[in-house]
Structure formats: structure tokens, C-alpha cells
């Protein structure tokens, strides 16, 4: 199984759980319902996954194909600077806050958006597939 870090890179991914989409070397879950950012994070963690951490522009562009105008929560927060849930800084794209309450990040087909973490939105989880080894 994909053990150790939740944020590892996966190789030769065989399969994803039901209702998850395999894309590249990872499994992605696009929610149908809406939750606030914290509840979305809990949902992902309960399924051995994490709120979407995007590694580069290429992954972002690929994922945006599956998105609409509706914003989805991702694992991005502003804690003295925009950082992903794995601790890495956001460095391949821009996001700006229009008010002090906009401390969580969301994505739609057009790009990233800062939002209040309380807004109920769709969300995206990301995980390693079954029977896979993590690459560290």
C-alpha cells in the first residue's frame, strides 16, 4: 500500500477506489456535495487521502479540464503566505486575497481563488492508488 507520507509521488498506479478517477499516477475524487474547507479536509483524511495538493502547472492544467466554473476546495491555505497542506509554498501560480477572511484556496477551470474557509464548496481529494509503492 501507499504508506508513509500522504503527499508522496506514486508510480505504476494500478487502480483507484469506486467513484475515484485515475489520472497520471494518482487517484482523484471530485465531490458531488459541498462542504466547508475543514469538513472537506476531514472527508479526504478519512479516506486515506488528502485535499488536492497540486505539484506543478502541468498537473493544474490537466485537472482544470475536469472542472467547471464552480470552485472546489484544494489543500491550500494562507498561513503567513500561501502553502499547500504538505507544507510546500505555492510557487507556480498566483492567488490573491481580497479580504482578511479569505485564507483558504479553491480552484475552478479558470484558476485559483482565495475564499473564506466557511463557504460550502465542492472539493477534490488526491491519493495513491491500491497496491502501489510510494516514491520518496
Amino acid at each position: 500500500l501507499c504508506q508513509g507520507s500522504n503527499y508522496s509521488t506514486c508510480a505504476s498506479c494500478p487502480s483507484c477506489p469506486d467513484r475515484w478517477m485515475k489520472y497520471g499516477n494518482h487517484c482523484y475524487y471530485f465531490s458531488v456535495e459541498e462542504k466547508d474547507w475543514n469538513s472537506s479536509l476531514e472527508f479526504c483524511l478519512a479516506r486515506d487521502s488528502h485535499l488536492l495538493v497540486i505539484t506543478d502547472n502541468q498537473e493544474m492544467s490537466l485537472l482544470q479540464v475536469f472542472l467547471s466554473e464552480a470552485f472546489c476546495w484544494i489543500g491550500l491555505r494562507n498561513n503567513s503566505g500561501w502553502r499547500w497542506e504538505d507544507g510546500s509554498p505555492l510557487n507556480f501560480s498566483r492567488i490573491s486575497s481580497n479580504s482578511f477572511v479569505q485564507t483558504c484556496g479553491a480552484i475552478n477551470k479558470n484558476g485559483l481563488q482565495a475564499s473564506s474557509c466557511e463557504v460550502p464548496l465542492h472539493w477534490v481529494c488526491k491519493k495513491c492508488p491500491f497496491a502501489d509503492q510510494a516514491l520518496f
Epitope: D36, N98, V101, A114, E118, V119, P120
Partner: antibody
């Protein structure tokens, strides 16, 4: 269409209390921060209070902290402003306002206002 | 607290003219500025956010500009419905402060 209707204004004695209400319709109330803004007789606009989506966070200018309390009832789609220890400077038209969405705290929609007059 | 200073306090102009209203912040507020229009006896109406982005339905003769501490709202080819008062507002942090307003009257 977004509709905000304020009520509860009127004449109140110096040091008295008053509770304003704002009935919201035409949008999903439980998705938005809500605020109160007032306009003085001199036509100056002053921000009064803002409440978060859950109601768990409330914000006030220092001059109104402790005297004013903003609250919301999402089941009733209603915003409230409880005002106490009122003084003559609180005489104003009080507007209920909705933010732009996603926590964009500009005042995208305004009600018609309710007049509060504080008299000796 | 951030103070917003609007100028002029009032101005007179004719239909078809172009006018510019200015708003100055006491410190750098980047682009976190909104503009509102208020007609006599009515509630304020939202015009612009982030200094230059027009709200939905606002005519293109309105344009906002500026960043940092100096901002302006320009109205090209004034129409009769444009007369009234205009207010700027800092929208990033608390307290949310408004300018004292500019009254635009028909000459």
C-alpha cells in the same frame, strides 16, 4: 433577485436599546457573510458590524464593540442587530448588506434601510 | 485605522462631460478598494471592486483605476442617471472604512 428588507427602526430614548432585523431572500443566505452599514444625517457611511457564514465570527469597529451585537438565523434567513446604550451619534439609517461571495467583503447588495432616531 | 479621503466633496458637471473622483488611502491598501453610487433617497449601489473591476451590470462609461494609496473613478460621457453621490471603501481588513463622499450635481 437578491432582496434585503430591514425593519425595527424607530424613535428610541438616549441610553435605550433597539433590535433591527433584516429579512433576506433571492439567494442562499447560509453561503454569505452579512453586514450592517449605517448612514448618518450628514450622509457619511459607517461600517457597523459583519458576521461570518456560521455566525461564529463577528466583527465590529472599536466604537461599537460591546454596545452592538450582530447575529443571524439561517433557518429564518434573517440577520439581526441588537443595539444598546444608544446615543445621539447612533442616529442614522441602518442598512443590511450582503458581501460579494467567497468572503469578498465589499457590500454587493444593500437593503432599503431603516431609520433609527435617538432622542433625549 | 486606515483613513479614506475623497475629493472633491462636490462637483457640478453637464450631461456628456467626463468627470474624475479621487480617493486617497492613509496607507498602502494595494487594490482593495470599492466604489458605490447613491442616488437621492435611495440605498447605495455597488459599482467597482478591487479598484478597477466593474460590478455586473455597471455601464462601461464607468472605470476605476489606481493602487497603493491613490485611486480614481472616472465617468465618461455623463448621463442624467449618473448624478448623485459616490463613495469609496477599503474592503480588505477591519475596520472597513468609507470615504466621506463626493456629490455630483447637474450644472
Amino acid at each position: 433577485d437578491v432582496k434585503l428588507v430591514e425593519s425595527g427602526g424607530g424613535l428610541v430614548k438616549l441610553g435605550g436599546s433597539l433590535k433591527l432585523s433584516c429579512a433576506a431572500s433571492g439567494f442562499t443566505f447560509s453561503r454569505y457573510y452579512m453586514s450592517w452599514v449605517r448612514q448618518t444625517p450628514e450622509k457619511r457611511l459607517e461600517w457597523v458590524a459583519t458576521i461570518s457564514i456560521s455566525g461564529g465570527n463577528t466583527y465590529y469597529p472599536d466604537t461599537m464593540k460591546g454596545r452592538f451585537t450582530i447575529s443571524r438565523d439561517s433557518a429564518k434567513n434573517t440577520l439581526y442587530l441588537q443595539m444598546s446604550s444608544l446615543n445621539s451619534e447612533d442616529t442614522a439609517v441602518y442598512y443590511c448588506a450582503r458581501e460579494g461571495g467567497y468572503g469578498n467583503l465589499w457590500f454587493a447588495y444593500w437593503g432599503q434601510g431603516t431609520l433609527v432616531t435617538v432622542s433625549a | 485605522d486606515i483613513q479614506m479621503t475623497q475629493s472633491p466633496a462636490s462637483l457640478s458637471a453637464s450631461v456628456g462631460e467626463t468627470v474624475t473622483i479621487t480617493c486617497r488611502a492613509s496607507e498602502n491598501i494595494y487594490s482593495c478598494l470599492a466604489w458605490y453610487q447613491q442616488k437621492q433617497g435611495k440605498s447605495p449601489q455597488f459599482l467597482v471592486h478591487n479598484a478597477k473591476t466593474l460590478a455586473e451590470g455597471v455601464p462601461s462609461r464607468f472605470s476605476g483605476s489606481g493602487s497603493g494609496t491613490l485611486f480614481s473613478l472616472k465617468i465618461n460621457s455623463l448621463q442624467p442617471e449618473d448624478f448623485g453621490s459616490y463613495y469609496c471603501q477599503y474592503h480588505y481588513g477591519i475596520p472597513f472604512t468609507f470615504g466621506s463622499g463626493t456629490k455630483l450635481e447637474i450644472k
